[in-house]
Interface confidence: low
Amino acid sequence: TALSPTPTTMTFTPAPLEETTTRPEFCKWPCECPQSPPRCPLGVSLITDGCECCKICAQQLGDNCTEAAICDPHRGLYCDYSGDRPRYAIGVCAQVVGVGCVLDGVRYTNGESFQPNCRYNCTCIDGTVGCTPLCLSPRPPRLWCRQPRHVRVPGQCCEQWVCDDDARRPRQTALLDTRAFAASGAVEQRYENCIAYTSPWSPCSTTCGLGISTRISNVNARCWPEQESRLCNLRPCDVDIQLHIKAGKKCLAVYQPEEATNFTLAGCVSTRTYRPKYCGVCTDNRCCIPYKSKTISVDFQCPEGPGFSRQVLWINACFCNLSCRNPNDIFADLESYPDFEEIAN
């Protein structure tokens, strides 16, 4: 390579303002906004500025930020003004850094994912370890299987169900059943040397606003693991849900807007209106997470060009969970929740 490698990082510190302790005014009233909002890079949030005036592209990690040019709330960024003492006028967008975790004597950094063994995938989040079971709640095959057996498979970590009356089941039904069965949660079932597998949906990539959730499934013609994705929106970013909590109550588990609206995605609009339910907030340090949900298909029509459809998380109910410290860690201790099947699906 042209420049000999030595990994290193250099961060940008904002140039100090002229030597004065007066803070500049970044907000102007009445609001003065350009006629058309800026076009943001793909994947960057278009948000209302800190002055509550104009639409701006959210500042990202390492960008300058002010009370007007605010950091991307969807990416867990905050404005670090420490490099601009004593005015604290221009900062740099920084990641909220949490504390690490210790498990079985091993220290993990905040955000680090690891597998303590072959059965669990864990993530350290703000001092707490949340784990996703990799051998998820195996259940015996249903309907056609009268003699299920739970067996260990050589070279594989997770136990599997096999059906001793395989020879007697109708071929077509078996295939359909296996597929419906696999799609209902993270389960494994042998079918002609193919173990059908569908993982649970990953947590939504954002705690508010539009995010992405993914899962791995080999329920396809090739029995090949493929990543499926769906859009998710746990709660709107621009609504202060706490204002909707009734007096004397500690939470509003489900928030639902009064009117049905269209979903919008990259300038394209859903062909019909929806009145989605969102997860609310819990004001007593519990976190509000989806409890019953499903995936729906939403058709979008674009102003120019063809339309398209996308899978979207549809929330039926949410609840305030005591053990979940990270608002997005919806798979911690999953199996102890009621209606696990509906959460996984």
């Epitope: 943001c40 793909l42 390492g62 300038g267």
Partner: antibody, heavy 119, light 110 residues
Framework: QMQLVQSGAEVKEPGSSVKVSCKAS??????LNWVRQAPGQGLEWMGG????????NYAQKFEGRVTITADESTNTAYMEISSLRFEDTAMYYC??????????????WGQGTLVTVSS | QAVLTQPPSVSKGLRQTATLTCTGD????????AAWLQQHPGLPPKVLSY???SRPSGISERLFVSRSGNSASLTITGLQPEDEADYYC???????????FGGGTQLTVL
Amino acid sequence: QMQLVQSGAEVKEPGSSVKVSCKASGDNSYPLNWVRQAPGQGLEWMGGIIPIFGTPNYAQKFEGRVTITADESTNTAYMEISSLRFEDTAMYYCAREGDGYNYSPLDYWGQGTLVTVSS
Amino acid sequence: QAVLTQPPSVSKGLRQTATLTCTGDSSNVGNQGAAWLQQHPGLPPKVLSYRNNSRPSGISERLFVSRSGNSASLTITGLQPEDEADYYCSAWDSSLGAWVFGGGTQLTVL
């Protein structure tokens, strides 16, 4: 290791169209962009797409004549230019944006696809 | 016509220091910062720095990037023959809604 693999070189006649592909390994939620470089010239952004969303974003200059599409299942982006002109002769690069779309640059690049427009 | 302005060429001696500049406006470099790319003949560009002035792992510590207002600069110390290449700055322009590039600077190591 993240890789972008582009389709092979093309020789086309003026007025025809060409479709170049770019297959990305890994996550399909990163924007894939198309950048061209005419012989001896600088880099010029044409547009981009996030395969998982499927909605493209074009540079004004190329709007209408260039179509960018993606196949989410194979994590492949396509760039088609219609009504080819001699001045479209260039190396066409596919480039992926990195984490934190607003500050990471186009951090992974394909090997390039040479499109020659000749009569 | 490139949106960002770079000097067409810079020549420096072996083991000397070269500083390349890139000037834009408040909707690109001034707003988002600039990234730097290096391109050797016949090869695709390679990222040297991110727009927050940090470097990807594996990029030499002989390289320094900085930004002041609407301008960014790339400094390479202790120049080596392999540093001879074209260098481009790039930024996202929020008013154009597009990635923009400089015209490129050809660095010659004498």
